[in-house]
């Protein structure tokens, strides 16, 4: 039976890398079989030499070399952009047009946005070599070379972020010549070589001067979570402080912070975090639902100045960001026991006030929910008839119920003499396993 054309396989965006030809695929159905023709930026391709395009019998377009295009700096498009290809499939009943596929060519420009600079660092302190790679398509990756060889990155000591190399603790062996290399499918570019010298810490003569520094911690503000960090980021605060005293002898500032304990209790130890700022900075990695104390300390090399005043901030509670763990269902005498383990501590997001337990519909229990208050991690539910019992559990903070656990099910047989909880070595059933068994 005759039918109009339909595109089955659309052409895909591609990078022309050469030296071999680029291929654009297009497949269509239809009766009579449709004829395929290709368009570039809406204009039909001639396919006649010197046109670099060639059509294969199956409708695939071969591009032997990149098509000619305007001056790269016409301001209308990047030189990467070779155009948009579409295919048309036609028979006597009509024409189908594919989605457009962009053909681009790999490019790596020569000019670095930021070149690494020569620097002197102190043993034990952190230092950063900045690098902003040239514009490239595809976007280039950055690697670092030291003394002519690729730098072996040590987790916890080296971090490459946004092109820059952060060295957590300088060692004498870090001395040398560093180079940032930007690479993509068009090739690679090398930055200038930056000389890094590492000095032993000085016996500072400024500590007396540093002791005269006064720091006023002015405010601590809870930052709005960055949507890019996902739905459940850890909270971060913005610290702002003022420095008075001698002319800026401090080389760096450290935040000291701890959770507040009950009045009269032994204070928690202060955690320390080096701040990336001289008057204000962000401090992350905190926990929701905690009361924190914050202060700031100036330092210069190994010398420390006096701590600032202490400011308090209560971080609001959030709902728990993980479900209770190890949820199990066990049969009892005319009852079913539900037990669980609290979510991991880092996911509490406040004080767990209790738990919510739901029974799921379409089982022997009608849909219902129970609230378990306090630290109790089990619940006994009365059962009146054989059949399947499925529950979910969620932890509750002052902000509400968090993420529920996966449904866990138990199948009670006729006389409730024994409960089927197959396969036994795998613990309770999931809803999926239960459905599969009931189907069998």
């Amino acid at each position: 039976q005759d039918s109009p054309p339909q595109i089955l396989v659309h052409p895909q965006d591609q990078l022309f890398q050469g030296p071999g030809p680029a291929r654009m695929s297009c497949q269509a159905s239809g009766q009579p079989p449709p004829t395929i023709r290709w368009l570039l930026n809406g204009q039909p391709l001639s396919m006649v030499p010197p046109d670099p395009h060639h059509l294969l019998p199956d409708g695939t377009l071969l591009l032997l070399q990149p098509p000619a295009r305007g001056h790269a700096h016409d301001g209308q498009a990047l030189s990467t952009d070779l155009g948009v290809y579409t295919c048309e499939a036609s028979n006597r009943l009509g024409t189908a047009v594919s989605r457009g596929a962009r053909l681009s060519v790999a490019v790596l420009r020569e000019d670095f946005q930021i070149q690494p600079r020569d620097m002197v660092a102190v043993v034990g302190e952190q230092f950063t070599l900045e690098c902003g790679p040239p514009w490239g398509h595809p976007e280039p990756t950055v690697s670092w070379w030291k003394d002519g060889k690729p730098l072996a990155l040590q987790p916890g000591r080296h971090t490459v972020s946004g092109g820059s190399l952060l060295m957590a603790r300088a060692e004498k062996s870090d001395e040398g010549t560093y180079m940032c290399v930007a690479t993509n499918s068009a090739g690679h570019r090398e930055s200038r070589a930056a000389r890094v010298s590492i000095q032993e810490p000085q016996d500072y003569t400024e500590p007396v001067e540093l002791l005269a520094v006064r720091i006023q911690l002015e405010n601590v503000t809870l930052l709005n979570p960055d949507p890019a960090e996902g739905p459940k980021p850890r909270p971060a605060v913005w610290l702002s402080w003022k420095v008075s005293g001698p002319a800026a002898p401090a080389q760096s500032y450290t935040a000291l912070f701890r959770t507040q304990t009950a009045p009269g209790g032994q204070g928690a130890p202060w955690a320390e975090e080096l701040l990336a700022g001289w008057q204000s900075a962000e401090l992350g990695g905190l926990h929701w639902g905690q009361d924190y104390e914050f202060k700031v300390r100036p330092s210069s090399g190994r010398a420390r100045g006096p701590d600032s005043n202490v400011l308090l901030l209560r971080l609001p509670e959030k709902v728990p960001s993980a479900p209770p763990q190890e949820v199990t269902l066990k049969p009892g005498n005319g009852t079913v026991f539900v037990s669980w383990v609290p979510p991991p501590a880092e996911n509490h997001n406040g004080i767990i006030r209790g738990y919510q337990v739901w029974s799921l519909g379409n089982t022997s229990l009608p849909p219902a929910n129970w609230t378990v208050v306090g630290e109790q991690t089990q619940l006994e539910i009365a059962t009146h008839m054989p059949g399947s019992y499925c529950v979910q559990v969620a932890a509750v903070t002052g902000a509400g119920a968090g993420e529920p656990s996966r449904p866990v099910c138990l199948l009670l047989e006729q006389a409730m003499e024994r409960a089927t909880q197959e396969p036994s070595e795998h613990g309770p059933w999931t809803l999926e396993q239960l459905r599969a068994t009931l189907k069998r």
Epitope: R102, D111, W135
Partner: antibody, heavy 118, light 112 residues
Framework: EVQLVESGGGLVQPGGSLRLSCAAS????????MSWVRQAPGKRLEWVAT????????YYPDSVKGRFTISRDNAKNTLYLQMNSLRAEDTAVYYC???????????WGQGTLVTVSS | DIVMTQSPLSLPVTLGEPASISCRSS???????????LNWYLQKPGQSPQLLIY???NRFSGVPDRFSGSGSGTDFTLKISRVEAEDVGVYYC?????????FGPGTKVDIK
């Protein structure tokens, strides 16, 4: 036709936060680096931030480093500027602009006004 | 940071006459690869800036040929061969050779 439309400006108190958006259309957003530029009333233009086309590389002047974050969502053809710890001197019209390589800003949006005042 | 200065800061012009604006940088805008990244923009009253000249001397598409740019190192010039009424506004130079990118203070061009 290249179009850039900023939104999200408004009045905010010192120390507050604001998030600007820039909706792009008429070009393949994911192959262009993008920038934010601002202009305080009666003042010269000031470059605020730049982001590479894939979002890996970001650049800021010292005046906003640590307070402002530029980001992008290529699936939504949208550029963002998250501004924290705002100060009175951040009051300005904020423009988003398209970059050709890192050579020049060719198209600019109409701007959105941010006022930081108590 | 590189400081950009412009002169004059105000330029009253006569229609049909030529005009010239100077832009100076506190250090050379030539990078390691001998490339120069200096651009000129016009901001008409109540509008966003628009690109006129990129990389010292390249006219952006749609910009009339009465506009031309020249210069090297630290000294750059924008010339208008015959000023027209639509050319009024503030002209800015911008260097993007070195981060942070910096603008000149602007030159206000109006009709005498």
């Amino acid at each position: 036709e290249v179009q850039l439309v900023e939104s999200g400006g408004g009045l905010v108190q010192p120390g507050g936060s604001l998030r600007l958006s820039c909706a792009a259309s008429g070009f393949t957003f994911s192959t262009y680096a993008m920038s934010w530029v601002r202009q305080a009333p009666g003042k010269r233009l000031e470059w605020v931030a730049t982001i590479s086309q894939g979002g890996t590389y970001t650049y800021y002047p010292d005046s906003v480093k640590g307070r402002f974050t530029i980001s992008r969502d290529n699936a939504k053809n949208t550029l963002y500027l998250q501004m924290n710890s705002l100060r009175a001197e951040d009051t300005a019209v904020y423009y988003c602009a398209r970059l050709i390589y890192y050579d020049y800003l060719d198209y600019w949006g109409q701007g959105t006004l941010v006022t930081v005042s108590s | 940071d590189i400081v950009m200065t412009q002169s004059p800061l105000s330029l009253p012009v006569t229609l049909g006459e030529p005009a010239s604006i100077s832009c100076r940088s506190s250090q050379s805008l030539e990078n390691e690869n001998k490339n120069l990244y200096l651009n000129w923009y016009l901001q008409k009253p109540g509008q966003s800036p628009q690109l006129l000249i990129y990389r010292v001397s390249n006219r952006f598409s749609g910009v009339p040929d009465r506009f031309s740019g020249s210069g090297s190192g630290t000294d750059f010039t924008l010339k208008i061969s015959r000023v027209e009424a639509e050319d009024v506004g503030v002209y800015y130079c911008l260097q993007v050779t070195h981060v942070p990118w910096t603008f000149g203070p602007g030159t206000k061009v109006d009709i005498k």
